[in-house]
Amino acid sequence: GIAIPRNSGCPNSEDKNFPRTVMVNLNIHNRNTSTNPKRSSDYYNRSTSPWNLHRNEDPERYPSVIWEAKCRHLGCVKADGNVDYHMNSVPIQQEILVLRREPRHCPNSFRLEKILVSVGCTCVTPIVHHVA
Amino acid sequence: GIAIPRNSGCPNSEDKNFPRTVMVNLNIHNRNTSTNPKRSSDYYNRSTSPWNLHRNEDPERYPSVIWEAKCRHLGCVKADGNVDYHMNSVPIQQEILVLRREPRHCPNSFRLEKILVSVGCTCVTPIVHHVA
């Protein structure tokens, strides 16, 4: 849960319900402009471990659309454009918060949910397992 | 905002407040095990564009701790361990949802906020600008 400092002048809450259920204002304060990740940069194409972004939609979740990265190659792309299979393209994963409608289909009731998404790919040196 | 299917059996809401403010259950449903990103994999160290993870803490935000990646080099690490400055290490950024206490210090009232975080780094071919 969340550590909860108390303060007068806050919206009222009943202790039996608290802090499990809170009020959340959905008028998002956006510190950055929200874009399709493909438009925000072309790193997915210029990387030595390039990736594609796959759209996943779920109307019971907010945000309803998330993008998952999938590496294009098992290896990494060399300067000549060929793939080096002595290196590995791997997904970088990030845990994110989403809101899940609960009960289902309800417009104004949600549960916080953590999900793991792949954001992009990076090129790593493989771990070599030496057999005795 | 959120597309809002209506359903009987949902918690009640007043139209004047709706759907700007919703109820959110903070008992997080965690689809994946939550870990310090350093422990989840060692890609940050094995990548050709390695990064360090910096802890960012804000008690007025949930999650209060987020980890920001910072690329270690301007270039990318070659097989011999030297840095190739003909390539660039760049951060992969992801827009995430956080809850911001509003009004400040209130335990049970939040506003949804989108912030941009750097999740890791990838190695890209630089864009070369040719001067006429």
């Epitope: 796959h54 998952e68 999938k70 294009r72 190659h73 994963q93 | -």
Partner: antibody
Framework: EVQLVESGGGLVQPGRSQKLSCVVS????????MTWIRQAPGKGLEWVAS????????YYPASVKGRFTISRDNAKSTLYLQMNSLRSEDTATYYC??????????WGQGVMVTVSS | DIVMTQSPSSLAVSPGETVTINCKSS????????????LAWYQQKPGQSPKLLIY???TRQSGVPDRFIGSGSGTDFTLTISGVQAEDLAVYYC????????FGAGTKLELK
């Protein structure tokens, strides 16, 4: 050595449910998308379901959407296929496959599911 | 949805011959931003699981003999087996995958 081993097949009555499992070894499971493919007796290959490496994104063809659910447990290196409201046309050998990238580079031996009364 | 049409459906060959299997898609499988064709070829021998031969239209999977050659771009693709051997008798499938997966109906390679 990469291995994918399916289990959970057998005879099931129409309208009933069945859950298939696929235990994998020999690779870092949570780096790869996984897919179930099926093959009806004497027929071609048909896509059944796919799941992203994190498990957060799933994809289905219209023929099974709403009846089948793909899931994974990365801690156990196991892929699942929950099949509900089974029909006779779901009778097939079900293959667990690894998506190398945009191709299926490793396949399990397959498990037979027979839907019949 | 993308439809993959394979031809011929069956093919009778003698060992040593060169055979060509065609696969035509209803939409282009070439992604301009990645400069790749999302097409793969599989071989399935009787009683066995399918095996990956070719991916991205022309890249041979590790361990696959060089007599298997994939070619084509956009909507028209070809699998060529030069100098067919008895062990090559199998069903061959083309396959497209991006978000969804689509397979051709298969081409059965038989002995003449």
């Amino acid at each position: 050595e990469v291995q994918l081993v399916e289990s959970g097949g057998g005879l099931v009555q129409p309208g009933r449910s069945q859950k298939l499992s696929c235990v994998v070894s020999g690779f870092t499971f949570n780096n790869y998308w996984m897919t179930w493919i099926r093959q009806a007796p004497g027929k071609g290959l048909e896509w059944v379901a796919s799941v992203s490496n994190t498990g957060s994104s799933t994809y289905y063809p219209a023929s099974v959407k709403g009846r089948f659910t793909i899931s994974r447990d990365n801690a156990k290196s196991t892929l699942y296929l929950q099949m509900n409201s089974l029909r006779s046309e779901d009778t097939a050998t079900y293959y667990c496959t690894r998506e190398g990238a945009y191709y299926l580079d490793y396949w399990g031996q397959g498990v037979m599911v027979t839907v019949s009364s | 949805d993308i439809v993959m049409t394979q031809s011929p459906s069956s093919l009778a060959v003698s060992p040593g011959e060169t055979v060509t299997i065609n696969c035509k898609s209803s939409q282009s499988l070439f992604w301009s931003e990645s400069h790749m064709n999302y097409l793969a070829w599989y071989q399935q021998k009787p009683g066995q699981s399918p095996k990956l031969l070719i991916y991205y239209a022309s890249t041979r999977q590790s361990g696959v003999p060089d007599r298997f050659i994939g070619s084509g771009s956009g909507t028209d693709f070809t699998l060529t087996i030069s100098g067919v051997q008895a062990e090559d008798l199998a069903v061959y499938y083309c396959h497209h995958h991006y978000d969804s997966h689509t397979f051709g109906a298969g081409t059965k390679l038989e002995l003449k």
